[in-house]
């Protein structure tokens, strides 16, 4: 039997087959965030658990210093959910005082950093105005999409306000990527 | 030609190639829920359509009694959306009465049950406070992520209140998983 | 070495292996929408960027005239996020006037057009009541799931109100699909 037996007719020799279990993959879960300095006008990055509980990295996908490192060029599906929680937003306090209703907001950004390019690239953004009436509120923002990444690219998750991130459970706030 | 011709150099012989069409996959869609008893402090599980309409299970991924059965160990992408709908939440009723604004909430949990472990594992949770001003509200919670599962694991979707689940259309509330 | 060496025992000869990089894939990003006529009772379809910035189509997955064209039968993961933004919804204006609180809503539908049936099939729907108190609001709706598609099927994203779609950034509103 020839090695080509299972290969469809339109597959070229230069497109190598891959064992799926061999592909770079990671699922990271939330940990309590330590307040860190971040540049003004730049959202702070979350750091993550990468080994304990549900979290894992495999097949040369590594996590270091808030970044997922892409070990191999290709198309990746990237996803994250961040659960936010807070007290009554400024919006409703302002409303009671009769001032204009400028809503607060919560934002999640999945960002790519490439050595060959000076500015980070925002891949995905979920942003939501928060103008809650109740005294305590909580809600998730979920993101996920496919992107062509290069070996050496780094991925991180940035949020508008780290103090609002719910870090209590690994199933509420997470970040992952896998090579397709 | 040797069988290894299409195999990248870092692929070991023990990592078998797979035909993608052969992988376990399922997309389940909502049906009207029959009220069932569930343990106090435990969210009820939804049951699903698995063959009619857009729903399907294939390649040994089976659905039975509210559970998706994992037929093969590996990394799976698991997702669900639940659309909730309700009348004005208690929160706004309470607010009008001048009592503290404890918001109601809606929650979806994707849960893994493993025979070898007595307690279910919560893989994913989406939870949101509901403190709506309008008399009727509706909104989806979406979840999706990758997990390493073992043959024999069972997946289910639990919700905080089955009576709030919108079961009217198969595109509004669904649950799926596929081997990567 | 035989070509079957890497094939698991349950894989039949008729299930060809595929190089992953050869699979149809697309990630489309938002552009400013030009108002177009649409049928009464039918949500308008968004059009998309398919080449610039983060957007791409590859391996015979083509974008034309608001549609993604499916070049090959199989199971696809399909996703979209639409970020909506607006001024205070009618709901809160009505509330102040003491009339019943019928909430406005925002809706995203991923629709399949197929030769097999004359009416479009709604694959995924995300719908949310909007009854905001703040004077400006914004929020995303995310959808994603797996579907069995046929060669020649066409996918589009419909929204309840094109004028509310945030087209300012490619990371806020997007649409994609890839063969599993």
């Amino acid at each position: 039997l020839k090695g080509q037996e299972f290969a469809p007719s339109h597959q070229q020799v230069y497109a190598p087959l891959r064992a799926d279990g061999d592909k770079p993959r990671a699922h990271l879960t939330v940990v309590r965030q330590t307040p860190t300095q971040h540049f003004k006008n730049q959202f702070p990055a979350l750091h993550w658990e990468h080994e304990l509980g549900l979290a894992f990295t495999k097949n040369r996908m590594n996590y270091t210093n808030k970044f997922l490192l892409i070990p191999e060029s290709g198309d990746y599906f990237i996803y994250s959910q961040v659960t936010f929680r807070g007290m009554t937003s400024e919006c409703s306090e302002i409303r009671q005082a009769g001032r204009p209703n400028k809503p607060d907001s919560i934002t999640v950004v999945i960002t790519k950093v490439t050595d060959s390019y000076p500015e980070p690239t925002q891949l995905l953004m979920g942003t939501k105005s928060v103008c809650e009436v109740g005294s305590n509120w909580f809600q998730p923002i979920y993101l996920g999409a496919m992107f062509s990444l290069q070996e050496g690219d780094k991925l991180m998750v940035n949020v508008s306000d780290i103090s609002l991130v719910d870090y209590t459970k690994e199933d509420k706030t997470f970040f992952g990527a896998f090579l397709l | 030609l040797k069988g290894q011709e299409f195999a990248p150099s870092h692929q070991q012989v023990y990592a078998p190639l797979r035909a993608d069409g052969d992988k376990p996959r399922a997309h389940l869609t909502v049906v009207r829920q029959t009220p069932t008893q569930h343990f106090k402090n435990q969210f009820p599980a939804l049951h699903w359509e698995h063959e009619l309409g857009l729903a399907f299970t294939k390649n040994r991924m089976n659905y039975t009694n509210k559970f998706l059965l994992i037929p093969e160990s590996g990394d799976y992408f698991i997702y669900s959306q639940v659309t909730f709908r309700g009348m004005t939440s208690e929160c706004s009723e309470i607010r009008q009465a001048g009592r503290p604004n404890k918001p109601d909430s809606i929650t979806v949990v994707i849960t893994k049950v493993t025979d070898s472990y007595p307690e279910p594992t919560q893989l994913l949770m989406g939870t949101k406070s509901v403190c709506e001003v309008g008399s009727n509200w509706f909104q989806p919670i979406y979840l999706g992520a990758m997990f390493s599962l073992q043959e024999g694991d069972k997946l289910m979707v639990n919700v905080s209140d089955i009576s709030l689940v919108d079961y009217t259309k198969e595109d509004k509330t669904f649950f799926g998983a596929f081997l990567l | 070495l035989k070509g079957q060496e890497f094939a698991p025992s349950h894989q039949q000869v008729y299930a060809p292996l595929r190089a992953d990089g050869d699979k149809p894939r697309a990630h489309l990003t938002v552009v400013r929408q030009t108002p177009t006529q649409h049928f009464k009772n039918q949500f308008p379809a968004l059009h998309w960027e398919h080449e610039l910035g983060l957007a791409f189509t590859k391996n015979r997955m083509n974008y034309t005239n608001k549609f993604l064209l499916i070049p090959e039968s199989g199971d696809y993961f399909i996703y979209s996020q639409v970020t909506f933004r607006g001024m205070t919804s009618e709901c809160s204006e009505i509330r102040q006037a003491g009339r019943p609180n019928k909430p406005d809503s925002i809706t995203v539908v991923i629709t399949k057009v197929t030769d097999s049936y004359p009416e479009p099939t709604q694959l995924l729907m995300g719908t949310k009541s909007v009854c905001e108190v703040g004077s400006n609001w914004f929020q995303p709706i995310y959808l994603g799931a797996m579907f069995s598609l046929q060669e020649g099927d066409k996918l589009m994203v419909n929204v309840s109100d094109i004028s509310l779609v945030d087209y300012t950034k490619e990371d806020k509103t997007f649409f994609g699909a890839f063969l599993l």
């Epitope: - | 063959e51 309409g53 857009l54 009217t168 259309k169 198969e170 | 097999s116 049936y117 099939t121 709604q122």
Partner: antibody, heavy 120, light 111 residues
């Protein structure tokens, strides 16, 4: 050409049982959901039950739930309806119907029907 | 009992136009489920007449047309002919019943 041919109808006493069959040809039977629809004499159409192509999903009208069982044998291209605890109000012509496009929920082909009479 | 409501009968002279209404609810037609129409000639099995709200299977004359709006639908027959004398049923899916639902049926008489 799609053909559906029902059989098994007849006269049965209240409380009795009957098994209807529907032989299908002209299409890939296992790819389609199938239904039973009935029509009482001089009355309108009433959906009775549906079964998915692979047979794993079944649904019933409330009026027959717990008494009727729909099933199929894809190797024989045959649909069945097992009717137990029959009542006078089950008297009707029973049609087997092929589902059209999935998610559209309609019947594109019907059999000619078989008459079930429940009477003492 | 039927979930979809139709008029019991309509009639018209040959060549005239008649319409049959079909009224549902928020769990069937109003939920977005398509409406389909069947014609049942005396003593025969029903036959699909209109599917997907407004589409005719091959062989159905273009005198028959369907439409849907909100929680209701309608079937129109233009240029009524003697062979159109039959019972007509609308049909949809109902999520609260997890099943198919038919209209009460309308007898069309050609005067």
């Amino acid at each position: 050409e799609v053909q559906l041919l029902e059989s098994g109808g007849g006269l049965v006493q209240p409380g009795g049982s009957l098994r209807l069959s529907c032989a299908a040809s002209g299409f890939t039977f296992s790819n389609y959901a199938m239904s039973w629809v009935r029509q009482a004499p001089g009355k309108g159409l009433q959906w009775v039950s549906v079964i998915s192509g692979r047979g794993g999903s079944t649904y019933y009208a409330d009026s027959v739930k717990g008494r009727f069982t729909i099933s199929r044998d894809n190797s024989k291209n045959t649909l069945y309806l097992q009717m137990n605890s029959l009542r006078a109000e089950d008297t009707a012509v029973y049609y087997c119907a092929k589902d059209g496009y999935s998610s559209a929920w309609y019947f594109d082909y019907w059999g000619q029907g078989t008459l079930v009479t429940v009477s003492s | 009992q039927s979930v979809l409501t139709q008029p019991p009968s309509v009639s018209g002279a040959p060549g005239q136009r008649v319409t049959i209404s079909c009224t549902g609810s928020s769990s069937n037609i109003g939920a977005g489920y398509d409406v389909h129409w069947y014609q049942q000639l005396p003593g025969t099995a029903p036959k699909l007449l209109i599917y997907g709200n407004s589409h005719r299977p091959s062989g159905v004359p273009d005198r028959f047309s369907g439409s849907k709006s909100g929680t209701s639908a309608s079937l129109a027959i233009t240029g009524l002919q003697a062979e159109d004398e039959a019972d007509y049923y609308c049909q949809s899916y109902d999520s609260s019943l997890s099943g198919y639902v038919f209209g009460t049926g309308t007898k069309v008489t050609v005067l």
